[in-house]
């Protein structure tokens, strides 16, 4: 506890102090007092710098004195031999003795008393900014008229803060302007305008005179403008050093004027007004602003329209324009929205074709569709090249957004047929020579694939079995081969309306209109062993002449066996119809004259015993296309004959092209359209 006075005696005083002692006393008097410490007796072993024995007086970090030896009073009326006066309320006394004393020393006696200090005069740093008043144990500060004492109870300032300006126009000046401003003051002025308006401050150079900066460039007195997180200033000096027009970009402005104790000048005067908050004319790429203005301010609305090929993507919805409003904070609404390149997305895949994975699917990108060559080609033209258009679709110059269609190439065998040994009279063939060849297992017969969904055959093949099982892609019709080949499932059988249905088909003598179509449930995938034959054109180029050669193929009867294991084929010439009439029917079921011959029939064969026979029915009589020698078309279908190994009769397909096309169109799936 602090005390007002006290006594300090060396150990054993007044007896001799012991050797090797170190003792300290912490003196503390109340706040606001100094300490007067005085010694009335001092008898300590003398040494240079009091190195052996000593009494040390310490104030804070400062040694006020170090004593040793003997002292006596200079004043007969006073017992004081040594004294110390400190203006602080704490003091430390330390006594030390070494290991030996040559004589008997009695030590010291000291006293301390609390003394008043004059804070107003005793210190280098004046505690009060204006008037200092001392009293015993303390002091107080006071101020001149119109000044008030700050909370620190030391500094005086003028009451110049707290003003809030809300008018859209106004004037503010430093206290007493143009008389000198008060020293040691902090004046704060607030301007608070309606949202959407920015404070614009205007000053004239001559309306500003504030104590200049020190040699380091720091303003001693300063004027600062704070708008949100932006600061203008500090400003000081003679004549306003900043911009004479300050656009704060904020509706709230704080003006802070800080002065020190010295150097008062006339101060400053400013005007302010509220401007509608401007929004920057932003550079939004790939877009147009409507209306176009040099300056946009609070509440202005613009429509931002994307250029062709660009869109605004918000969530999953794409739009070509959006509205943006200049907001009260000087920022545009919807500023996150951007005109991005239209993304056409991953292009749709197409049946029997492909599209390379595009490097980009954005506006202007190009993709190319190709068909699975050589089995498919692009039917609807356009070259297969599509670009990503402004509307977000992949577009072709010819087809627009319509996708290309890959359709089977017809009439082109992967390997040409070469006649080998004579077999009735034909040769071994490979399915790759006749990829259109279809095998019917019940009845044992043939057919011709004409596109993905349709098989052409003879009416007499399907009249007794409207759900025939068919196979494609196999040279051999052995069971193990068929199990590995492609089985075709019929959806519907269409027999030509001119085909006469009989109760006893075995006794048939009229094979006119011996033609039928089988619609398949699923499309056939084309390849080297499966691809369609072309249909004849309707022009006279497709009228057959006697001697024109055609190819027949099938698994029908041969000289050696009822049914061929592997595909057989032969090249036959077209013959006049009378040649067929002249041949005697081998096993007539009726009178020879009863057999009907019509222009819907082609007669072919007669050379080297090459002919079609039982089990070949429905297969194509394939003739080279007169307009494209690389292709074959189905000129005929194996129909009937008077005798195997002579001449055979074939349905003249050209006469049925209209019926074929009509039937296919009327029974196509939407996917085929």
């Amino acid at each position: 506890e602090p005390t007002m006075y006290g006594e300090i005696l060396s150990p054993n005083y007044p007896q001799a102090y012991p050797s090797e002692v170190e003792k300290s006393w912490d003196i503390e008097v109340p706040e606001g007092y100094g300490i007067h410490l005085y010694f009335t007796h001092l008898d300590i072993e003398l040494s240079e710098n009091c190195a052996y024995d000593s009494v040390q007086i310490i104030s804070g970090d400062t040694e006020e004195g170090r004593l040793c030896g003997q002292r006596s009073s200079n004043n007969p009326h006073s017992p004081i031999v040594e004294e110390f006066q400190v203006p602080y309320n704490k003091l430390q006394v330390i006594f030390k003795s070494d290991f030996s004393n040559e004589e008997r020393f009695t030590g010291f006696a000291a006293y301390y008393v609390a003394t008043d200090i004059n804070e107003c005069t005793d210190f280098v740093d004046v505690p009060c900014s204006h008037f200092c008043n001392n009293f015993i144990g303390g002091y107080f500060c006071s101020c001149p008229p119109e000044y008030f004492l700050h909370d620190d109870m030391k500094n005086c300032g003028v009451n110049c803060s707290g003003d809030v300006f809300t008018a859209l126009i106004g004037e503010i000046a430093s206290p007493n302007y143009p008389k000198p401003y008060p020293e040691n003051s902090r004046c704060e002025y607030q301007i608070r305008l309606e949202k959407g308006f920015q404070v614009v401050v205007t000053l004239r150079r001559e309306d500003f005179d504030v104590e200049a900066a020190d040699s380091a460039g720091n303003c001693l007195d300063s004027l600062v403008f704070v708008a949100g997180d932006r600061q203008f200033g500090p400003y000081c000096g003679h004549g306003f050093p900043g911009p004479l027009n300050i656009e704060t970009k904020s509706n709230a402005l704080d003006i802070i004027f800080q002065t020190d104790l010295t150097g008062q000048k006339k101060g400053w005067k400013l005007r302010y007004h509220g401007d509608p908050m401007p929004c920057p004319k932003e550079d939004t790429p790939n877009s147009v602003w409507e209306p176009a203005k040099a300056k946009y301010v609070f509440r202005d609305v613009v429509q931002i329209t994307c250029l062709d090929g660009f869109e605004v993507v918000e969530g999953r919805v794409g739009a070509t324009s959006f509205y943006s409003t200049c907001q009260s904070n000087g920022k545009w609404s919807n500023s996150k929205l951007k005109c991005q390149p239209v993304d056409c997305g991953i292009p749709e895949s197409i049946e029997n074709g492909k599209v390379e994975d595009p490097e980009s699917t954005l506006f202007g990108s190009v993709i190319r569709y190709t068909c699975e060559e050589p089995y498919y080609y692009m039917e609807n033209g356009g070259g297969g090249e599509y670009h990503c258009a402004g509307n977000g679709s992949w577009v072709n110059e010819v087809l627009g957004p319509e996708l290309p269609k890959c359709v089977p190439v017809c009439g082109v065998p992967r390997e040409p047929f070469e006649e080998k040994q004579r077999i009735i009279g034909g040769s071994d063939a490979d399915i790759k020579n006749f990829p259109w060849q279809v095998f019917f297992d019940n009845p044992w017969a043939g057919g011709a694939l004409i596109n993905e969904y349709w098989v052409l055959t003879a009416a007499h093949v399907v009249e007794g079995n409207r759900e025939p099982t068919m196979y494609v892609g196999s040279t051999s019709v052995q069971t193990s081969r068929l199990a590995k080949s492609k089985m075709l499932t019929p959806e519907h059988v269409f027999i030509h309306p001119g085909w006469k249905l009989l109760e006893v088909p075995e006794g048939r003598t009229n094979f006119d209109n011996d033609i039928a179509l089988v619609r398949l449930k699923d499309p056939v995938k084309m390849g080297p062993t499966v691809s369609p034959i072309c249909l004849p054109g309707t022009s006279s180029d497709y009228n057959l002449m006697d001697g024109d050669l055609g190819l027949i193929s099938g698994w029908g009867r041969t000289e050696k066996r009822d049914r061929a294991v592997r595909l057989k084929a032969a090249r036959l010439p077209v013959a006049p119809l009378r040649k067929c009439k002249e041949v005697k029917v081998e096993k007539p079921t009726a009178d020879a004259e009863a057999y009907v011959f019509t222009p819907n029939m082609i007669c072919a064969g007669g050379e080297k015993g090459m002919d079609s026979c039982k089990g070949d029915s429905g297969g194509a009589f394939a003739v080279q296309d007169p307009n494209d020698k690389t292709k074959f078309y189905a000129a005929g279908l194996v129909s009937w004959g008077p005798q195997c190994g002579t001449y055979g009769l074939y349905t003249r397909v050209k006469n049925y092209v209209d019926w074929i096309m009509k039937t296919m169109q009327e029974n196509s799936t939407p996917r085929e359209d």
Epitope: N442, Q478, T479, S480, L482, A483, M487, K560
Partner: antibody
Framework: EVQLVQSGAEVKKPGASVKVSCKVS????????MHWVRQAPGKGLEWMGT????????IYAQKFQGRVTMTEDTSTDTAYMELSSLRSEDTAVYYC????????????WGQGTLVTVSS | DIQMTQSPSTLSASVGDRVTITCRAS??????LAWYQQKPGKAPKLLIY???SLESGVPSRFSGSGSGTEFTLTISSLQPDDFATYYC?????????FGQGTKVEIK
């Protein structure tokens, strides 16, 4: 009409081999696919393998792999089946059979050859 | 390999009965299934091929049905000549495999 005539019955000791022949008449071996099927006394039918002329390879049932060899002599229209490392459970009637067309597994069967494996 | 399982192993029936034999494949074989009849000391005789096609010369009382993995052979009215062992066989892929057989005997 196709006929298949097989070689006569055989008695073999365990560990020995047997070779059964099958002569084709009424057709040529090149036009046919020959399969071999066996039937142990009082047991079911077991498919052993075939020569696939389309692939030009012989396909053996997994069970007989490494023990059976099927060959053909097209000049005599004769097919052969040789089974080695015989054991008692190989005692069976061995049939040669021609593959059928249009979904029929087998067309013509030989009369069968009884092979007895006994020590 | 595709396993073929026939049921029942033995079937006792009388003349005139309707008889059904079932064959189950361990995986789909589409319609590539045949049925045979075998009498003691004889080679098997083909009855049905492609699951439901009747071999020529086979009486119409025999019929086959099914596809995928479940197949049946039906004899609509059992005749004295029909007492024999019946086998199913898959020909979808090699190895071609037979069922273990169903013996139809007189009740």
């Amino acid at each position: 009409e196709v006929q298949l005539v097989q070689s006569g019955a055989e008695v073999k000791k365990p560990g020995a081999s047997v070779k059964v022949s099958c002569k084709v008449s009424g057709d040529t071996l090149t036009e046919l696919s020959m399969h071999w099927v066996r039937q142990a006394p009082g047991k079911g039918l077991e498919w052993m393998g075939t020569f696939d002329p389309e692939e030009g390879e012989t396909i053996y049932a997994q069970k007989f792999q490494g023990r059976v060899t099927m060959t053909e002599d097209t000049s005599t229209d004769t097919a052969y089946m040789e089974l080695s490392s015989l054991r008692s459970e190989d005692t069976a009637v061995y049939y040669c059979v021609t593959e059928g067309l249009g979904g029929r597994p087998f067309d013509h069967w030989g009369q069968g050859t009884l092979v007895t494996v006994s020590s | 390999d595709i396993q073929m399982t026939q049921s029942p192993s033995t079937l006792s029936a009388s003349v005139g009965d309707r008889v059904t034999i079932t064959c189950r494949a361990s995986q789909s074989i589409s319609s590539w299934l045949a049925w045979y009849q075998q009498k003691p000391g004889k080679a098997p005789k083909l009855l049905i091929y492609k699951a439901s096609s009747l071999e020529s010369g086979v009486p119409s009382r025999f019929s086959g049905s099914g596809s995928g993995t479940e197949f049946t052979l039906t004899i609509s009215s059992l005749q004295p000549d029909d007492f024999a062992t019946y086998y199913c066989q898959q020909v979808n892929s090699y190895d071609w495999t037979f069922g273990q057989g169903t013996k139809v005997e007189i009740k």
